[in-house]
Interface confidence: low
């Protein structure tokens, strides 16, 4: 067959859908690979062809669009399952072509099972809510295009395994779930089940997302350097190991990049001709406030190193701070016979 621009298997689109539920999958060609949309392609005389490779098979097969009740159908650039079956899992290819042009892409589709508490291998999106911040909402995701606006579906919300009704601070409002005030106890998986009629049949869409309650911006502060501080002096003799921790607390800030770094004599450690290693560890609180520790280590410190300036720096979207460590050379203990005798005026 003639050459076709093959975009390969688009693993970025790892599509997961629930068994026995409707699924509508758009051909990725028009979303990610081509510079024109389906309408343009269609009016230019290009045809969209679908085929698939079953799980654990190498054979490309046509998709059977003649199943009872049109279980699988194509509408414009969308492949429809009404509903999916477990053995629909496989790699699906959409190919756009005419006599002179051909472009195709494949993508994996995984049909997954859920248990009666909505547990499944599905990768869940995470929605972050600010703690004690006032009313915040989550919206039942990815349900657009399944039914016309004239159809009024019923929506039931669950937290974990339980239907949300009479919760103190969580109120279902159709496609939205309102948190009057979010607490740590609201962390968990929330599921909306959308039920709608179509051609005498009833379909269910199940969408689960993880809610994570995080620090509120109204409580956010610039980075706080806990160490080094004024109470600790790093006193070393030449030849000893110098270890200085820089411990910084960062309030949670959405999409903020938290940075910690050391400077030695105003330069980055890499730009100084000494053998410095820096090890970093990161921990998070339940509200995703972050504590970063960077330990600066010089295995065998010299008297020259002990005269340098060691400064810990930190930066977040809230601001930048710096703190110098107090580093000193330890004064050797006096030798009695010489220094002490001289001190007493012995001759």
């Amino acid at each position: 067959s003639e050459r076709c621009d093959d975009w390969g298997l688009d693993t970025m689109r790892q599509i997961q859908v629930f068994e026995d539920e409707p699924a509508r999958i758009k051909c990725p060609l028009f979303e990610h690979f081509l510079k024109f949309n389906y309408s343009t392609a269609h009016s230019a005389g290009l045809t969209l062809i679908w085929y698939w490779t079953r799980q654990d098979r190498d054979l490309e097969e046509p998709i059977n669009f003649r199943l009872p009740e049109n279980r699988i159908s194509k509408e414009k650039d969308v492949l429809w399952f009404r509903p999916t079956l477990l053995n629909d899992t496989g790699n699906y290819t959409c190919m756009l072509r005419n006599t002179t042009y051909c472009s195709k892409v494949a993508f994996p589709l995984e049909v997954v099972q859920k248990d009666s508490c909505f547990n499944s291998p599905m990768k869940l999106p995470v929605h972050k809510l600010y703690i004690e911040y006032g009313i915040q909402r989550i919206t039942c995701p990815n349900v657009d295009g399944y039914f016309p606006s004239s159809v009024k579906p019923t929506i039931t919300w669950y937290m974990g395994c339980y239907k949300i009704q009479n919760f103190n601070n969580v109120i279902p409002e159709g496609m939205n779930l309102s948190f009057l005030i979010a607490f740590i106890s609201n962390n968990g998986n929330y599921t909306c089940v959308v039920t709608y009629p179509e051609n005498g049949r009833t379909f269910h869409l199940t969408r689960t997302l993880t809610v994570k309650v995080v620090g509120s911006p109204k409580n956010a502060v610039p980075p706080v350097i806990h160490s080094p501080n004024d109470h600790v002096v790093y006193e070393k003799e030449p030849g000893e190991e110098l270890l200085i921790p820089c411990t910084v607390y960062f309030s949670f800030l959405m999409d903020s990049r938290n940075e910690v770094w050391w400077t030695i004599d105003g330069k980055k450690p890499d730009d100084i001709p000494i053998d410095v290693t820096i090890n970093e560890s990161i921990s998070h609180s339940r509200t995703e406030d972050e504590t970063r520790t960077q330990i600066l280590s010089i295995k065998k410190v010299t008297s020259e190193d002990l005269k340098r300036s060691y400064v810990c720096h930190a930066r977040s979207a809230k601001g930048e701070v710096a703190k110098a460590a107090t580093v000193k050379q330890k004064v050797p203990a006096p030798r009695y016979t010489v220094e002490l005798a001289c001190g007493f005026g012995a001759t």
Partner: antibody, heavy 117, light 110 residues
């Protein structure tokens, strides 16, 4: 394997308060509703009410004025208090977890509480 | 007087099929799902059927549930002596804003 166990006195005097605790083992009190149900001798099941992990409650309207439920997430326990009891409150009291689809999927063994002077 | 109405008793011989009915109204069975529970003497109640006809794992397929309008029923086929128990239907009631049970049906295996 989640298990529920009721505990509390088996004998309560009339006009006093009946107090029961249900301990959840093998699981957490989060994400479910925790119910109390009773069965008087030779009668049917009667729903008393439920509580969720955040303290949200819903009580049977016929018992509402006398019922108080509480939850202790640190101990994985929830409790029932029924005030001003009479002989009509003599029953086997069950605690039950309400899972998905509004169903009591896990029950305690039940504890008999007799109201008598 | 229970909100959901069940026959007080039912009986059948081993191997037979018996049906237990549960009648309600638009505010309970009519608009919510029905569950069925089995109470064997001296044991904790057991969930038999949820969401009108779903069986939890471990419940034999001899037990089946159905719902139509404001009524529901539990059918037990291939009746066995160990099925002798009390059976209760239950549903949420929107008007009462609470859970309601049927009065229970005592099943005797003759």
């Amino acid at each position: 394997q989640v298990q529920l166990q009721e505990s509390g006195p088996g004998l309560v005097k009339p006009s006093e308060t009946l107090s029961l605790t249900c301990t959840v083992s093998g699981g957490s009190v989060f994400s479910y509703f925790w119910n109390w149900i009773r069965q008087p001798p030779v009668k049917g099941l009667e729903w008393i009410g439920y509580i969720d992990h955040s303290g949200g409650t819903n009580y049977n309207p016929s018992l509402k004025s006398r019922v108080t439920m509480s939850v202790d997430t640190s101990k994985n326990q929830f409790s029932l208090k029924l005030s001003s009891v009479t002989a009509a409150d003599t029953a086997v009291y069950y605690c039950a977890r309400e899972g998905l689809h509004d169903a009591f999927d896990i029950w305690g063994q039940g504890t008999l509480v007799t109201v008598s002077s | 007087q229970s909100v959901l109405t069940q026959p007080p008793s039912a009986s059948g011989t081993p191997g037979q099929r018996v049906t237990i009915s549960c009648s309600g109204s638009s505010s309970n069975i009519g608009s919510n799902t029905v569950n069925w529970y089995q109470l064997l003497p001296g044991t904790a109640p057991k969930l038999l059927i949820y969401s009108n006809y779903q069986r939890p794992s471990g419940v034999p397929d001899r037990f089946s549930g159905s719902k139509s309008g404001t009524s529901a029923s539990l059918a037990i086929s291939g009746l066995q002596s160990e099925d002798e128990a009390d059976y209760y239907c239950a549903a949420w009631d929107d008007s009462l804003n609470g859970r309601v049970f049927g009065g229970g049906t005592k099943l005797t295996v003759l």
